[in-house]
């Protein structure tokens, strides 16, 4: 399977909410011994590899924000911790998964990475990630709503093994 990032850049004004999205593509094994661990974290382009460093999102780690379920099942983070930090991650039946961030500030700017790990028989078998940039703009020149910029077809299917 692969992870696609429909948008590579989100430009938002302070105070707005945004939903960053990744999509699971390709054949997904739905056997009951196969589950998917999906999560989000901040990172940098890095001098070596994008998404190699895992930084917290609003002080929540990738472990705090993870979803863990079978194939294309739906799931979302219902725990209070994420919601207290204005965050919610979710996954639907179609392989889309997302993180919603509320009341953005400049401090939320940066590179965001989604990570999917396929787990078979309790062992990590395959992991892929996608990356996208969030730019939060301040002041009079900021857009009134979030503007999203599609990934190039090459970027959109991010097959980088982590």
């Amino acid at each position: 399977f692969k992870v696609a990032t429909p948008y590579s850049l989100y430009v938002c004004p302070e105070g707005q909410n945004v939903t960053l999205t990744c999509r699971l593509l390709g054949p997904v094994d739905k056997g009951h011994d196969v589950t998917f661990y999906k999560t989000w974290y901040r990172s940098s382009r890095g001098e070596v590899q994008t998404c190699s460093e895992r930084r917290p999102i609003r002080n929540l780690t990738f472990q705090d924000l993870h979803l863990h379920h079978g194939g294309h099942q739906a799931a979302n983070t219902s725990h209070d911790l994420a919601q207290r930090h204005g965050l919610e991650s979710a996954s639907d039946h179609h392989g889309n998964f997302s993180i919603t961030m509320r009341n953005l500030t400049l401090l939320d700017s940066g590179l965001y990475c989604c990570l999917v790990v396929e787990i078979r028989h309790h062992h990590s078998e395959h992991r892929v990630h996608g990356a996208m940039e969030l730019q939060v703009q301040t002041g009079k020149d900021a857009p009134s709503n979030c503007v999203v910029y599609p990934s190039s077809s090459q970027d959109s299917e991010n097959i980088t093994a982590a």
Epitope: R45, E47, R58, N59, H85, L107, L111, E133
Partner: antibody
């Protein structure tokens, strides 16, 4: 080890444009961090001017925004400050500095040695 | 703008004695549990150098006699035993909201 080095004319005439460059060695400015300009008028405190991030987005101090442009030259691994319509009040030591970006912590961890700019006819 | 107010503005300390500088922000500098408050020292004729970030984290290479504390709007920098090399101007700074702002500075001298 990351090093920052400011350069530019030490004397600028009133109403002209001040142009400074910060050369970065030991790190690629397109990999991470925000790259800042800060100034310090003679005998006074520090004033943040603005930054450009590794991805090219900028943020400026609203008090200077109409006159400031920060840009990057990736081929030379350097970033620049342009401040238009200068007056004597823009006389200061100008520092470039690196700040964390895209993480929980934002702070200036590496500074250049500073360059003195005097605005005078 | 967030206004940073430092006290005292000058300080004269005997070597080996402790020193303390306060900084008050005009509004909270908290961001989801982190205080976005820094302390810098500018030694005579030099660029500022980072001492403390996020209110209480001591930057690598900074002597452990420096410590920072506080949250919300009130912060303190402490030097447990002042040494001659600690002379200079100390600045607090917030990165919670643009424009990022500094305190007016506290000058430390040795008695």
């Amino acid at each position: 080890q990351v090093q920052l080095q400011e350069s530019g004319p030490g004397l600028v005439k009133p109403s002209e444009t001040l142009s400074l460059t910060c050369a970065v060695s030991g790190y690629s400015i397109t990999s991470d961090y925000a790259w800042n300009w800060i100034r310090q008028p003679p005998g006074k405190g520090l004033e943040w001017i603005g930054f450009i991030t590794y991805s090219g987005s900028t943020n400026y101090n609203p008090s200077l925004k109409s006159r400031v442009t920060i840009s990057v030259d990736t081929s030379k691994n350097q970033f620049s400050l342009k401040l238009s319509s200068v007056t004597a009040a823009d006389t200061a030591v100008y520092y470039c500095a690196r700040s964390h970006y895209g993480s929980t912590y934002w702070y200036f961890d590496v500074w250049g040695q500073g360059t003195t700019v005097t605005v005078s006819s | 703008d967030i206004v940073m107010t430092q006290t005292p503005l000058s300080l004269s300390v005997t070597p080996g004695q402790p020193a303390s500088i306060s900084c008050r922000a005009s509004e909270s500098v908290e961001y989801y549990g982190t205080s976005l408050m820094q302390w810098y020292l500018q030694k005579p004729g030099q660029s500022p150098q980072l001492l403390i970030y996020a209110a209480s984290n001591v930057e690598s290479g900074v002597p452990d006699r420096f410590s920072g504390s506080g949250s919300g709007t009130d912060f303190t920098l402490k030097i447990s035993r002042v040494e001659a090399e600690d002379v200079g101007v100390y600045y607090c700074q917030q990165t919670r909201k643009v424009p990022w702002t500094f305190g007016q500075g506290t000058r430390l001298e040795i008695k």
